[in-house]
């Protein structure tokens, strides 16, 4: 990711910028953006970044609000890179099953599953 | 999701079936399946289920191994339903920003971020 700071620090800074610019961002009272109904965030990255794009196009740029959207685009780059890594390595069935078991285990313990 | 048991129970049962049928599933030693190289599983659901499809087509069906693949297809249906809910509701900027803050907060605390 072409940034001088680690992604984790980038995320922290972006959270702070989001708070700082909240008033400016909510100025458009007619704008509507898709908001996921659940908290399985990683499933919704595409929609989240589409929403960010919509918001950016409606926001007066300048100063540190530009930095906010720049950061968000770097975070998107990072996530896109992670998505590329989903199918990059072809491994034996054994390793795939290990990953599948881990995936289901995480689903079992960490996902937000509604009955 | 068209299943008589809740998704959470379905996931638990599938984990058990995966252990039971492991020996049968790894019988094909030449088969190679894409395995994600990171642990942000939700980003990789498409590739995971493509891999499951590959595995199913190479596995002798019958008995409870069929139940395993049936369960996995129900889990896929559940996830597809969750993905639909990502963009289902168009809300105001205020709510989008609350969700974005939550998403970045989760990225900050729970994601496995490589520097």
């Amino acid at each position: 990711i072409p940034t001088e700071i680690p992604t984790s620090a980038l995320v922290k800074e972006t959270l702070a910028l989001l708070s700082t610019h909240r008033t400016l961002l909510i100025a458009n009272e007619t704008l509507r953006i898709p908001v996921p109904v659940h908290k399985n965030h990683q499933l919704c990255t595409e929609e989240i970044f589409q929403g960010i794009g919509t918001l950016e196009s409606q926001t007066v740029q300048g100063g540190t609000v530009e930095r906010l959207f720049k950061n968000l685009s770097l975070i998107k780059k990072y996530i896109d890179g992670q998505k590329k890594k989903c199918g990059e390595a072809r491994r034996r069935v054994n390793q795939f099953l290990d990953y599948l078991q881990e995936f289901l285990g995480v689903m079992n313990t960490e996902w937000i599953i509604e009955s | 999701i068209p299943t008589e048991i809740p998704t959470s129970a379905l996931v638990k049962e599938t984990l058990a079936l995966l252990s039971t049928h492991r020996t049968l599933l790894i019988a094909n030693e030449t088969l190679r399946i894409p395995v994600p190289v990171h642990k942000n599983h939700q980003l990789c659901t498409e590739e995971i289920f493509q891999g499951i499809g590959t595995l199913e087509s190479q596995t002798v069906q019958g008995g409870t191994v069929e139940r395993l693949f049936k369960n996995l297809s129900l889990i896929k249906k559940y996830i597809d339903g969750q993905k639909k809910k990502c963009g289902e509701a168009r809300r105001r900027v205020n709510q989008f920003l609350d969700y974005l803050q939550e998403f970045l907060g989760v990225m900050n605390t729970e994601w496995i971020i490589e520097s």
């Epitope: 509507r32 937000i112 | 809910k85 709510q95 609350d98 803050q101």
Partner: antibody, heavy 119, light 107 residues
Framework: QVQLVQSGAEVKKPGASVKVSCKAS????????INWVRQAPGQGLEWIGY????????RYNQKFKGRATLTVDKSTSTAYMELSSLRSEDTAVYYC????????????WGQGTLVTVSS | DIQMTQSPSSLSASVGDRVTITCKAS??????LSWIQQKPGKAPKTLIH???RLIDGVPSRFSGSGSGQDFTLTISSLQPEDFATYYC?????????FGQGTKVEIK
């Protein structure tokens, strides 16, 4: 089954504070926002605010900002609403209500807690 | 804040009657409106969400309609257990706001 059980009735003097609890059971606590609503005797319903147990983020009705504080204890799946500088017009039944999704309708309500402010 | 104006504030009806309650928002709230029933001394109960979606377990005699600013709750055939106060709630924007309520009484 999904339940929200609130603490018992309270009688407070003007100027004091009250802390009402709302214990959740039957679901994963961090999955759903908890809203707080109040109802003065013979009056309608009024939204105080919500808290997201997932990240402790809360948002308030401006009318209550500075006086109401929403918190959660994840270890006990309990949400709290504290109201300070109480006055007689704060006498009301206070309800917690679970949000079905993110900023959706209230699908489960607590039984209510009567707070009486009287000198 | 978004104002929710409910009418009528009270009505008298008989068992079997068709009852209609309306709610008007001071601005466009899309379809983010729910209808809530409250019986004396009891906690509120949500009947309908997103303007017209009936919540599981709620009898089909209840129905909702509308979008934008104008909304309606209809009880097709009033039953004895339906005598209560009904509120609309907009959850489109913060702060969420309720209508002032409509008390449905026995004629």
């Amino acid at each position: 089954q999904v339940q929200l059980v609130q603490s018992g009735a309270e009688v407070k003097k003007p100027g004091a504070s009250v802390k009402v609890s709302c214990k959740a059971s039957g679901y994963t606590f961090t999955n759903h926002h908890i809203n707080w609503v109040r109802q003065a005797p013979g009056q309608g319903l009024e939204w105080i605010g919500y808290i997201n147990p997932y990240n402790d983020y809360s948002r308030y009705n401006q009318k209550f900002k500075g006086r109401a504080t929403l918190t959660v204890d994840k270890s006990t799946s309990t949400a709290y609403m504290e109201l300070s500088s109480l006055r007689s017009e704060d006498t009301a039944v206070y309800y917690c209500a679970r949000d079905y999704g993110n900023f959706w309708y209230f699908d489960v309500w607590g039984q209510g807690t009567l707070v009486t402010v009287s000198s | 804040d978004i104002q929710m104006t409910q009418s009528p504030s009270s009505l008298s009806a008989s068992v079997g009657d068709r009852v209609t309650i309306t709610c008007k928002a001071s601005q466009d709230i899309n379809s983010y409106l729910s209808w809530i029933q409250q019986k004396p001394g009891k906690a509120p109960k949500t009947l309908i969400h997103r303007a017209d979606r009936l919540i599981d377990g709620v009898p089909s005699r209840f129905s909702g309609s509308g979008s934008g600013q104008d909304f309606t709750l209809t009880i097709s055939s009033l039953q004895p257990e339906d005598f209560a106060t009904y509120y609309c709630l907009q959850y489109d924007d913060f702060p969420y706001t309720f209508g002032q309520g409509t008390k449905v009484e026995i004629k």
